[in-house]
Interface confidence: medium
Amino acid sequence: VPRWRQQWSGPGTTKRFPETVLARCVKYTEIHPEMRHVDCQSVWDAFKGAFISKHPCNITEEDYQPLMKLGTQTVPCNKILLWSRIKDLAHQFTQVQRDMFTLEDTLLGYLADDLTWCGEFNTSKINYQSCPDWRKDCSNNPVSVFWKTVSRRFAEAACDVVHVMLNGSRSKIFDKNSTFGSVEVHNLQPEKVQTLEAWVIHGGREDSRDLCQDPTIKELESIISKRNIQFSCKNIYRPDKFLQCVKNPEDSSCTSEI
């Protein structure tokens, strides 16, 4: 008799999820000498233990605690780059500017980036058919709780000047409902963080507007200022040139505004 399976609204667990997590862990520890001590099998066991046999709408931060301990890592707290709705450019930037870090440049962020996962209550099976959607099904699902946990703690670790890359092409440049807007902004520690500097990335080549005057940016400034953190904002009019100038800062064309 086929067993009844809960149908969720979101896509199922990424194909070859266990193999992918294990392979990423091995690759990360090979590239980062300071993480060579990490036992990737233990990391996978802790990851799996966070969601296997548990109802995928009833996951807690506590479920991920064993994984958090295994992923312990120092981050240069004054070199943190947050991002919202512009992940690819943020990652291209930290690939060039190697001393800056996004969450996905850490072991835990790297392991889970772009993956989906969930289990089923009372069975050891991974659900490859469907997983809960944050809006349509439930917010306490394995993927959402993972990112909320690591994002909160990443923001808590930040100090001095924290940068955030925002997508100037979106209707809401700053979105209160994004991970940045709902989690990271509220977990920056005012006694450690002096300034949040927003980089608003322009989409169109001919777009010369000052997007730092956008109402949603003003809303972000207000939230940050109320938390006793200074706020600054820069327009990045030409993201392609911006990256090129990060690679070659001595280029003569890099003295003009980008």
């Epitope: 605690q65 958090m68 301990k69 890592q73 120092t74 240069p76 707290c77 670790a157 520690q189």
Partner: nanobody, 119 residues
Framework: EVQVLESGGGLVQPGGSLRLSCTAS????????MSWVRQAPGKGLKWVSA????????SYADSVKGRFTISRDNSKNTLYLQMNSLRVEDTAVYYC????????????RGQGTLVTVSS
């Protein structure tokens, strides 16, 4: 500016004891959970122990449970780690970190204090 200064490390024989201290400044110490982490020679960073802001809740890595005790004195802005029954494998640089429970991310503020357990 947030600053932490660890002290109390040294050379000790297996089975011996040490008490590490961490003096903090530049932030409201009593508002933050604090942790001890350590880095053995040639190895990565490992979480050791954490304590809540009030000191009412503590947690420990399995490898130190029953031997190490974390505590804090909020009136002195100081975090402590009492280390008993020390083993050779406890040899490491110990750092105190301003952080939420057991990590996973710690900032890189303290210089650390070296604990060497050797006969």
């Amino acid at each position: 500016e947030v600053q932490v200064l660890e002290s109390g490390g040294g050379l000790v024989q297996p089975g011996g004891s040490l008490r590490l201290s961490c003096t903090a400044s530049g932030f409201t110490f009593s508002s933050y959970a604090m942790s001890w982490v350590r880095q053995a020679p040639g190895k990565g960073l490992k979480w050791v122990s954490a304590i809540s802001s009030s000191g009412g809740s503590t947690s420990y890595a399995d490898s130190v449970k029953g031997r190490f005790t974390i505590s804090r004195d909020n009136s002195k802005n100081t975090l402590y780690l009492q280390m008993n029954s020390l083993r050779v494998e406890d040899t490491a640089v110990y750092y105190c970190a301003l952080g939420s429970g057991s990590g996973p991310f710690f900032d890189n503020r303290g210089q650390g204090t070296l604990v060497t357990v050797s006969s």
